[in-house]
Interface confidence: medium
Amino acid sequence: QAGPLPKPTLWAEPGSVISWGNSVTIWCQGTLEAREYRLDKEESPAPWDRQNPLEPKNKARFSIPSMTEDYAGRYRCYYRSPVGWSQPSDPLELVMTGAYSKPTLSALPSPLVTSGKSVTLLCQSRSPMDTFLLIKERAAHPLLHLRSEHGAQQHQAEFPMSPVTSVHGGTYRCFSSHGFSHYLLSHPSDPLELIVSGSLEDPRPSPTRSVSTAAGPEDQPLMPTGSVPHSGLRRHWE
C-alpha cells in the first residue's frame, strides 16, 4: 500500500461533555480492512483499551457505563489492518461535569439590558478555582475561558460585554474548574437568560438543553468585548 493508512475518526455519543455517573460511548471509525481498534488515553498506559471491529468492520465501540474522573481526558484511536497500524485519530477531549459544586451566574447591573449598553456576567464559585468557562446555549464552542494567572485561587470571574447587541441575547451557563485538569468541570450553574431590548430583532428563544448535547452549528462562538477583567484572570478565546 502506498503511503500511511488514513487516520480514523473519533467521537463520543451523546457528546464529549458528560455529567458524572452518565454513560458515554466512544466510537472509532476506520476502514473496512480494520482488524482491531485501539484507544489510547493521554497519560495512561497504552493501549487504554482494545476492541474488535463491529460489522462491517469499519468501526469499534468503547463503552463507559458510568462517567467518573478517571475517564476524563484526551483520547486518540488507531486501527490495525493487514498492512499495519493507522495514523492516530485527531484527539477527543472527554470532559466530565459535576466534579465540583455549581457556581452562580448573575448579570450586573441586570439581565435585562438595552442594546448599546454594557453588562457584566459574573460567575461565582463556592470554592476557590482558577478557571471559569462561560457557555452560551446553542453556540458551537465554549464562549470564553478565563484562567487566573500564577494559579491564583479566585471565587469569581467577570465576563464584560460592551456594547451589547441583540446577538448577545440568549441563555448562558458557567462552569468552574482547576487548571490542573481542565477535563474536570463543576456542575453547570443555573441558566441565566440575557434579554436585550431596544433593538429591531428580539433575541431568539434558546431552548434548555443538557450539557452533553452536541452543540448545533447555528451560532458561532460569541465573543464578549471590552477590557480584560482586573481580577487576575487571563482571557483565553476558545
Partner: antibody
Amino acid sequence: QVQLKESGPGLVQASETLSLTCTVSGFSLTSYCVNWVRQPSGKGPEWLGRFWYDEGKVYNLTLESRLSISGDTSKNQVFLKMNRLRTDDTGTYYCTRDRDTMGITGWFAYWGQGTLVTVSS
Amino acid sequence: ETVMTQSPTSLSASIGERVTLNCKASQSVGINVDWYQQTPGQSPKLLIYGSANRHTGVPDRFTGSGFGSGFTLTISNVEPEDLGVYYCLQYGSVPYTFGPGTKLELK
C-alpha cells in the same frame, strides 16, 4: 439558634503549638462553612482558613505552613492547630459561619465571642 | 493577595448625619465584599454581604454599593449605636482580606 464557641488555652509559649476548638450548635457542619479569623488587639481582623465538609479546606497562604484545620462533624466541632507560635500571633481568635448553604456571599455572618490567646516569649 | 484600603481612617459624625465610608480593592473582586461593624469588646457584626445586601436584622439606614474594585457603605441617619469601627472584607480571591477599618466617632 446559631451559636459558635471557641475554646483553648489563654496563654501559650512561643515556638509551641496552639490548639483551639470551635463547638457549634443550631446548624450542621455538613451544610455550612466554618472559618477561623484572628484579630490582634487594636488592629483589623485577619482570615486564617476555612473548613467545609464537602468542599475541603482552604488556608491563608502566608500561614499555611503553620496551620492545620480539621473538623469532627459528629461532635459539631472544628479544630485549629497553629505551630511554631510567635509573639505576634497574640490576639483574639474567632470562628465564624457563612450566611447560607450556597456559600457564595456573606462568609462571616455569624461569629463566636472569640478567645484571647497570648503568646509569651 | 488583594489589598483592601479604607477611607477615611476615622470620621466624626453628628446624630442624624449621613456618612459615606469607602473601600478600595487592589484588584477586581466582583461583588464579593462584605461590611462589618465592631464595637469595643464585641465580635464583628455582618451588616452588608455581596456588596449591597443587608444582613438579617440590619436597619435600612445602612446601604452598600459597588462592583469590581470600589465599594461604599452609606449610613443615612447616624444613630448612637452606629459608633465603632467598620471593616470591609473581600473574598473574591484567596486569601480573603479585611481592610484596616474606619473608626466612626460621635462629634
